[in-house]
């Protein structure tokens, strides 16, 4: 794992040149996290966002923590246990399972830093892995060998 | 737009307590990004990882940049234009499309920091949005109203 030069700001330190220099790119909500205007039910729509047109449809659940970066995460929640028939868009097909796709997302929390002899020296960012469900996928069930 | 309390390290500054304190959690590749032992073809397997059992199967392509955090990103690439039949696991069903699910991921680039009078003062992290394809999803085609 690579480490980059970094530091732990303590009170009184000049923070005018930011280590995390925010670019001017606008940050829209994630495309998949845009809420769905369609009713949340076990059916595959013929319009709307990807998560409502999928034959393994899902909704997004907000997970907010003002003391975490990013503050807002969205977890996929499957609306059907099986896949929806491509033919009807509503009846379930028991030959396919709707399964969550997971991702270990890197998040940051602010924690006190400790200097020499355990003294408190400002705050550090602690990196963590946080499991997020991204989507529901229509899969063939596992055949146990 | 999110902002962190932060600072820009200059040479000679004690960096032993890292602002970006990498946790000791081992960081395996994302579960979905584990390379697929199954041949990459347009078929839905009955075992293996989610991306090979999906009826919209996909492979992962590595995108590595040593001056970016995270350094390794994986992009999903659909193996079929349509969904695979749940019945056979191999024949395509033209009633369903295999579509990429995108996500604007926050990444950080390492850039030189500039202090007063344009002097070089260590490195800063610049936040950017980076479009990543997460998975392929079997969807009903859009019906234009």
């Amino acid at each position: 794992y690579s480490h980059w030069p970094s530091c732990c700001p303590s009170k009184g330190q000049d923070t005018s040149e930011e280590l995390l220099r925010w670019s001017t790119v606008p940050v829209p909500p994630l495309e998949p996290a845009r809420p769905n205007r369609h009713p949340e039910s076990c059916r595959a729509s013929e319009d709307g966002p990807l998560n409502s047109r999928a034959i393994s449809p899902w909704r997004y659940e907000l997970d907010r923590d003002l003391n975490r970066l990013p503050q807002d995460l969205y977890h996929a929640r499957c609306l059907c246990p099986h896949c929806v028939s491509l033919q009807t868009g509503s009846h379930m097909d028991p030959r396919g399972n709707s399964e969550l796709l997971y991702h270990n997302q890197t998040v940051f929390y602010r924690r006190p830093c400790h200097g020499e002899k355990g003294t408190h020296k400002g705050y550090c960012l602690e990196r963590r892995l946080y499991r997020v469900s991204l989507a529901c996928v229509c899969v063939r069930p596992r055949v146990m060998g | 737009y999110s902002h962190w309390p932060s600072c820009c390290p200059s040479k000679g500054q004690d960096t032993s307590e890292e602002l970006l304190r990498w946790s000791t959690v081992p960081v395996p590749p994302l579960e979905p990004a584990r390379p697929n032992r199954h041949p990459e073809s347009c078929r839905a397997s009955e075992d293996g990882p989610l991306n090979s059992r999906a009826i919209s199967p996909w492979r992962y392509e590595l995108d590595r940049d040593l001056n970016r955090l995270p350094q390794d990103l994986y992009h999903a690439r659909c193996l079929c234009p349509h969904c695979v039949s749940l019945q056979t696991g191999s024949h395509m069903d033209p009633r369903g499309n295999s579509e990429l699910l995108y996500h604007n991921q926050t990444v950080f680039y390492r850039r030189p920091c500039h202090g007063e009078k344009g002097t070089h003062k260590g490195y800063c992290l610049e936040r950017r949005l980076y479009r990543v394809s997460l998975a392929c999803v079997c969807v009903r085609p859009r019906v234009m109203g």
């Epitope: 907000l62 923590d65 003391n67 807002d72 | 999110s2």
Partner: antibody
Framework: QVQLVQSGAEVKKPGASVKVSCKAS????????ISWVRQAPGQGLEWLGW????????KYAQKVQDRITMTTDASTTTAYMELRNLRSDDTAVYYC?????????????WGQGTLVTVSS | DIQMTQSPSSLSASVGDRVTITCRAS??????LNWYQQKPGKAPKLLIY???SLQSGVPLRFSGSGSGTDFTLTISSLQPEDFGIYIC?????????FGGGTKVEIK
């Protein structure tokens, strides 16, 4: 009873900056966030952003993100909102409000408001 | 940004009347909707959070319902002190956005 007490009214010229304070009491400051909302005369409410009091992490509305800075001082349990390069359309009553740090982001206690007038 | 549309924009009702105010979101916001009451020259006051939970100290005549895009605030029996502007707010996606308000007057 939870209280948020804001600083007094300000009159500023276009291009100037204003810093509004919000003193919190009767609750554990670091367990919550502070959100800032403004209301122009005769208009509706506009969310400006928020800050986690423990972390200092902020989220700003895009409309003001280049001109706004929110900070907190845990030692005095005070939140601050600074708005720079003021324009006449920044004339409004500015409110601070307490917000939980989790998913249910409702504003359960509000300050009394600070009128900021921008006029040449 | 998510648009929040309230109706009616104003209403006049008598003491004891049942009053219903609606709020529609331009996109699904699950149950991430709050209702506030604001009186002239005062800060807003929280009435209902997460669509249907009554804030502590708020009279039981206030109730909220709905999820997805359509929400309702109901005052079961209007009281003289209930005049003011009622405002909905979505908190599902930043920027948080507010409705334009419904002005309630007592006949």
């Amino acid at each position: 009873q939870v209280q948020l007490v804001q600083s007094g009214a300000e009159v500023k010229k276009p291009g100037a900056s204003v810093k509004v304070s919000c003193k919190a009491s009767e609750y554990t400051f670091s367990n919550y966030g502070i959100s800032w909302v403004r209301q122009a005369p005769g208009q509706g409410l506009e969310w400006l952003g928020w800050i986690g009091a423990y972390s200092g992490f902020t989220k700003y509305a895009q409309k003001v993100q280049d001109r706004i800075t929110m900070t907190t001082d845990a030692s005095t349990t005070t939140a601050y909102m600074e708005l720079r390069n003021l324009r006449s359309d920044d004339t409004a009553v500015y409110y601070c409000a307490r917000v939980g740090t989790g998913t249910d982001s409702y504003f359960d206690f509000w300050g009394q408001g600070t009128l900021v007038t921008v006029s040449s | 940004d998510i648009q929040m549309t309230q109706s009616p924009s104003s209403l006049s009702a008598s003491v004891g009347d049942r009053v219903t105010i609606t709020c529609r979101a331009s996109q699904n916001i699950n149950s991430h909707l709050n209702w506030y009451q604001q009186k002239p020259g005062k800060a807003p006051k929280l009435l209902i959070y997460t669509a249907s939970s009554l804030q502590s100290g708020v009279p039981l005549r206030f109730s909220g319902s709905g999820s997805g895009t359509d929400f309702t605030l109901t005052i079961s029996s209007l009281q003289p002190e209930d005049f003011g502007i009622y405002i909905c707010q979505q908190t599902y996606i930043t920027p948080l956005t507010f409705g334009g308000g419904t002005k309630v007057e007592i006949k």
